[in-house]
Amino acid sequence: EEGLQVIQPDKSVSVAAGESAILHCTATSLIPVGPIQWFRGAGPGRELIYNQKEGHFPRVTTVSDLTKRNNMDFSIRIGNITPADAGTYYCVKFRKGSPDDVEFKSGAGTELSVRAKPSAPVVSGPAARATPQHTVSFTCESHGFSPRDITLKWFKNGNELSDFQTNVDPVGESVSYSIHSTAKVVLTREDVHSQVICEVAHVTLQGDPLRGTANLSETIRVPPTLEVTQQPVRAENQVNVTCQVRKFYPQRLQLTWLENGNVSRTETASTVTENKDGTYNWMSWLLVNVSAHRDDVKLTCQVEHDGQPAVSKSHDLKVSAHPKEQGSNTAAENTGSNERNIY
């Protein structure tokens, strides 16, 4: 009896999630008579995987026919492996007893590791937009991978970033793992078309890393620069005052003309021109009838961009001077807007 050995030839077996695992086990003798049972883990918390004698184990099939008289192969196949199946499996011989069978000898165990792919990385940026020169944080998360070893890199427009912190959880042993990384990115005025990429490499991906992206267009706010100029028009008593709103992003913008502090007109940016860097330009003009004014007029172009506090630029219109002698002609950028006469 003492001569019986339970042989588990494989110290370890690695299987991809979704595949079947074969766990090998042979006995060196037919004596003592009694069933084989398979367990995962050791100690009082060990889990019954298969009992040759009784029970229903839908995911487990035997490799050979255990009903054959001289069978000494007790290998099993476990189907549709998931990360939760990872662990050490023991093939244990029981000796027939009364009223209960008694554990006789155990195999040395086979460690089953499960290779599971990480989920597609999800990159999320800050809740609120930020302006150039500010540093913003992006997070990248991927879940459900095994084994624990994983590599995560950050890129901005193809350039690798170095300012980031990464954690893999949990710290101890687990059936599967999650990775969480936070990268810091300094915004520039040219970042409307920029992308931040989180790249995850894992043994299950066969050298083809997974990527998650975030467009900085969702994160950046480029505040506009304003320029107010005046040009003469054909009629000597009229002056065209333009407000050029340049290099802003996103498009959401409202412009108000003030005449000596009083609201003259409010309009929303509609027909904008897009610059190569993804920012926008827009121009509004005001047709001023100077003959209707005795005193000088202070014209203010006030812009509220993307819900931020208004910025403004003013222009003093001297009514005493001849219109044709004032301002400079920069009509080349006139992209059009409404006209308004002030009477």
């Epitope: 367990f39 050791a42 100690g43 009082p44 918390g45 060990r46 019954l48 209960d100 554990e103």
Partner: antibody, heavy 122, light 107 residues
Framework: EVQFQQSGTVLARPGTSVKMSCKAS????????MHWVKQGPGQGLQWIGA????????TYNQKFKGKAELTVVTSTSTAYMEVSSLTNEDSAVYYC???????????????WGQGTLVTVSA | DIQMTQSPSSLSASLGERVSLTCRAS??????LNWLQQEPDGTIKRLIY???SLDSGVPKRFSGSRSGSDYSLTISGLESEDFVDYYC?????????FGGGTKLEIN
């Protein structure tokens, strides 16, 4: 009917050892892990460790390694626990209980002994 | 080690009242949780196993449930013999750990 009969109250001196017993009846002794649990005066329950009578396999709570030693005598279906180097901290009621030879939900800690009171005093 | 945080540590209630005791697990224990009852003389009895399965001979006014990492024992319609101590126990992972206990007292 499954029963665990534990040995009686013990008064012991600091620095000495005590050995208590838990005799099982009513089922196959070798099909179960025997566990020991400590309850200090006015305190909660702490798992000490367990022993498997088939092969004397033991597992301990790290806090009790070197403090408690578990043994069994299969022929009498009796589990023993020896607590050594006694201090006041070891004054407690010690319970035995059991779980099946594998993790079967219905068999975890169903039956309990009545407890053995150990008082450590100079 | 898995910590089992049991609340409340003591509870005053009246006969016929419905009460709930809770244990929160610091790590995933699945459904591997028992509820135990301890009499003043030290006798320990298991009431619930596997989170919600009632032991034979235990009155139906006892029930167990789970919400995420929170495990509850509910006694609907307290009777005089219910005013004792209660413990939860996780048996998912060694070392097996108990909650700190709840002393149920009569109002």
């Amino acid at each position: 009917e499954v029963q665990f009969q534990q040995s009686g109250t013990v008064l012991a001196r600091p620095g000495t050892s005590v050995k208590m017993s838990c005799k099982a009846s009513g089922s196959t002794f070798t099909s179960y892990w025997m566990h020991w649990v400590k309850q200090g005066p006015g305190q909660g329950l702490q798992w000490i460790g367990a022993i498997y009578p088939v092969n004397n396999d033991t597992t301990y709570n790290q806090k009790f390694k070197g403090k408690a030693e578990l043994t069994v005598v299969t022929s009498t279906s009796t589990a023993y626990m020896e607590v050594s180097s006694l201090t006041n901290e070891d004054s407690a009621v010690y319970y035995c209980t059991r779980s099946f030879y594998y993790s079967l939900d219905a068999a975890w800690f169903v039956y309990w002994g009545q407890g053995t009171l150990v008082t450590v005093s100079a | 080690d898995i910590q089992m945080t049991q609340s409340p540590s003591s509870l005053s209630a009246s006969l016929g009242e419905r009460v709930s005791l809770t244990c929160r697990a610091s790590q995933d224990i699945g459904s591997r949780l028992n509820w135990l009852q301890q009499e003043p003389d030290g006798t320990i009895k298991r009431l619930i196993y596997a989170t919600s399965s009632l032991d034979s001979g235990v009155p139906k006014r006892f029930s167990g449930s789970r919400s995420g990492s929170d495990y509850s024992l509910t006694i609907s319609g307290l009777e005089s013999e219910d005013f004792v101590d209660y413990y939860c126990l996780q048996y998912a992972s060694s070392p097996f750990t108990f909650g700190g206990g709840t002393k149920l007292e009569i109002n």
